[in-house]
Interface confidence: low
């Protein structure tokens, strides 16, 4: 008799990452009988929702349902119908919504309300939409990359070696850059974490981890650019801002009302004698770098050592995975190779920023001008943040690995979030509260 293929006994989970600039839906899949094994969950689909981040829908909440339709329908196609009802759906909103909540808790709530109602209309097991904390975002990103790199596994592997994996079980640090915030998370070497807010303790697969994490709100690449513009326009004598972070020949008109719309620019806000100003690019990496450094207050530190703005940062330890916008920007600039030294990256950035805007547009004709125009700033910002903000050096630069995917799954907080909420990381209950959510509202 012929052997019939048994139906696949698998489970699925969906996580929506509602970021400041866009929303992405991730579908994960794992063998039902191996739920507690490490490394068995993998991503089968990513769907990028067309349009901006959900925080931009405050004035048009009625459009949220349509906005989410395509990707939710895609999930309906990818996941077998028989599995729909038992597939959990989680939506986590990050710094864009944290900023909106700072402006108005009511507005943030209204957006989440409509998101929840929209997602409840699908046949899945909707588990709630919430604004995750910066601490959670950092922690879940750290869990994701170490889970995918096999760092929590004590087994000898018979399958192909995971990229970046060494034989030791030392965890990787996680560097995450978004549009509105950036997170740094790692296990320091025998170092007391001097500020309790930055300390996480949890037990994963029978091992204890003391983890440092911090999320810098307003220091994602988009909000950092708004901050820089708000700072620089203060000293501009008229409504022309000659900006070294944009290519020579680049011009763009900015509304002052848009500049001051975000809470991130409040500290620079002043009454200006004009409603609009024009950015005129001059393309100078060194000057751009200097301007960015002014966003980091390094003169005050109440601890033994700090990153910036008085935030404790222990000495860097081990290898780091840099993902999300760290990866996307450096990938565009062709600087993700392990062989490219920090000095070489700086040299390449100098050349790139100095290229005339017309030349850049011709060379990258397929790229949207809005994104294309900001790569000089973003690349320079990444260097400034890593070197002066987090204190990486030319030597320790080689410990930064720019990672997009690991084993086919995107590096980011979503997988760690789902692993935690579906109780798929066996261990005693984590001691730290941010990673335990018993109820969703």
């Amino acid at each position: 008799t012929q052997n019939k293929a048994l139906p696949e006994n698998v489970k699925y989970g969906i996580v929506l990452d509602a970021g400041s600039s866009h929303t992405s839906l991730y579908i994960y899949k794992w063998p039902a009988e191996k739920e507690n094994d490490t490394g068995v969950v993998h991503q089968v689909e990513e769907c990028r929702v067309k349009g901006p981040g959900i925080s931009k829908f405050v004035q048009k909440v009625n459009e949220i349902g349509i906005y989410l339709t395509d990707c939710m329908e895609r999930a309906r196609e990818v996941i077998p119908r028989s599995q729909h009802q038992e597939t959990p759906v989680y939506l986590g909103a990050t710094a864009g919504m944290r900023l909106l909540r700072m402006e108005s808790e009511e507005l943030a709530d209204r957006v989440l309300d409509v998101v929840e109602r929209s997602l409840s209309n699908y046949p899945f097991d909707f588990q709630g939409a919430r604004i995750i904390t910066g601490q959670e975002e950092g922690a879940y990103g750290w869990i994701t990359i170490n889970y995918l790199l096999g760092k929590f596994s004590q087994k000898t592997r018979w399958f192909s070696i995971v990229p970046y994996e060494t034989n030791n079980q030392e965890t990787f640090g996680a560097l995450d850059l978004g549009g509105a915030s950036t997170q740094v998370t790692f296990v320091p070497q025998n170092q007391t974490i001097e500020s309790p807010d930055n300390a996480l303790q949890f037990r994963l697969y029978g091992k204890d981890y003391n983890v440092y994490t911090h999320s810098f709100l307003c220091y994602g690449k988009d909000q950092a650019l708004w901050q820089k513009l708000a700072k620089d326009i203060q000293v501009a004598s008229n409504e022309i801002l000659r900006d070294p972070c944009f290519h020579p020949g680049y011009k763009k008109v900015v509304n002052v009302s848009d500049l001051y719309k975000t809470p991130c620019t409040k500290r620079f806000e002043m009454t200006l004698p004009f409603q609009q100003f024009e950015i005129q690019g001059i393309g100078n990496y060194q000057q751009c770098h200097q301007s960015i450094l002014e966003l980091f207050n390094t003169s005050y530190c109440p601890y033994s050592q700090c990153a910036f703005n008085g935030i404790f940062l222990p000495p860097l330890q081990g290898d780091f995975g840099a993902f999300s916008a760290f990866y996307f920007v450096m990938k565009f600039l062709n600087l993700t190779s392990e062989k490219v030294s920090q000095e070489k990256v700086t040299e390449m950035m100098k050349k790139f920023c100095a290229q005339p805007w017309e030349e850049i547009k011709t060379s990258y004709a397929g790229v949207k001008e809005k994104y294309l125009s900001e790569y000089c700033f973003s690349g320079t910002y990444i260097l400034s943040l890593l070197l002066q903000g987090y204190h990486f050096t030319a030597d320790s630069w080689e410990h930064i690995h720019f990672i997009g995917k690991i084993q086919g799954s995107d590096a980011g907080w979503t997988l760690g979030y789902m692993l935690n909420l579906t109780n798929m990381i066996p261990a005693e209950q984590p001691l730290s509260t941010p990673l335990s959510h018993s109820t969703y509202v």
Partner: antibody, heavy 116, light 111 residues
Framework: EVQLQQSGPELVKPGASVRMSCKAS????????MHWVKKNHGKGLEWIGY????????TYNQKFKGKATLTVNTSSKTAYMELRSLTSEDSAVYYC?????????WGQGTLVTVSA | NIVLTQSPASLAVSLGQRATISCRAS??????????MYWFQQKPGQPPKLLIY???TQGSGVPARFSGSGSGTDFSLNIHPMEEDDTAMYFC?????????FGSGTKLEIK
């Protein structure tokens, strides 16, 4: 189900202080601000202020600055309000109410009576 | 501070009839195209209960006979048809800006 359980009634002397509590359950405590509202016979409802349980940041109604102090203990999911230098004007029912989703969840109230 | 003036101070309505309570704000409570006006019902010995949020959206589990309308500075709460259980104090509240403020309340009774 979201629940806010407030501490019992207090009888206090003029000039003294009182500290009341509000224990939250049924939701992630740090996801929502906790607001406090005063209900007295003559003046109806008055908003006192709120605290963000994530970082302990507070925003007060100017009228209650120096009168009320809001604090939280995230591990016990409890919010506290201390009222100082009490006078008969402070005799009222005080409610805690969860921020966001529009004050849909309220505690049962703590009655404070200031009397010599 | 935004002052909310509620009227009438008290109102008696026959069972099955319509009760209308008004609330006027000293300045607009609209922001981003949303009216930050709320209506609460409070019975003796109980905390306030949310009836209407964002001027016209019903709170969870609120009967359809409660409806809200208005924008900018003028708002109203309608109860129709009036039921015995609706005897209570009704308050409007704005949360457009700090300090959040409440109206002085309307006492609704059965005629």
């Amino acid at each position: 189900e979201v629940q806010l359980q407030q501490s019992g009634p207090e009888l206090v002397k003029p000039g003294a202080s009182v500290r009341m509590s509000c224990k939250a359950s049924g939701y992630t405590f740090t996801d929502y601000n906790m607001h406090w509202v005063k209900k007295n016979h003559g003046k109806g409802l008055e908003w006192i202020g709120y605290i963000n349980p994530n970082n302990g940041g507070t925003t007060y109604n100017q009228k209650f600055k120096g009168k009320a102090t809001l604090t939280v203990n995230t591990s016990s999911k409890t919010a506290y309000m201390e009222l100082r230098s009490l006078t008969s004007e402070d005799s009222a029912v005080y409610y805690c109410t969860r921020g966001g989703t529009r004050f849909a969840s309220w505690g049962q109230g703590t009655l404070v009576t200031v009397s010599a | 501070n935004i002052v909310l003036t509620q009227s009438p101070a008290s109102l008696a309505v026959s069972l099955g009839q319509r009760a209308t309570i008004s609330c006027r704000a000293s300045e607009s409570v609209d922001n981003y195209g949303i009216s930050f006006m709320y209506w609460f019902q409070q019975k003796p010995g109980q905390p306030p209960k949310l009836l209407i949020y964002a001027a016209s959206t019903q709170g969870s589990g609120v009967p359809a006979r409660f409806s809200g309308s208005g924008s900018g500075t003028d708002f109203s709460l309608n109860i129709h048809p009036m039921e015995e259980d609706d005897t209570a104090m009704y308050f409007c509240q704005q949360s457009k800006e700090v300090p959040f403020t409440f109206g002085s309340g309307t006492k609704l009774e059965i005629k």
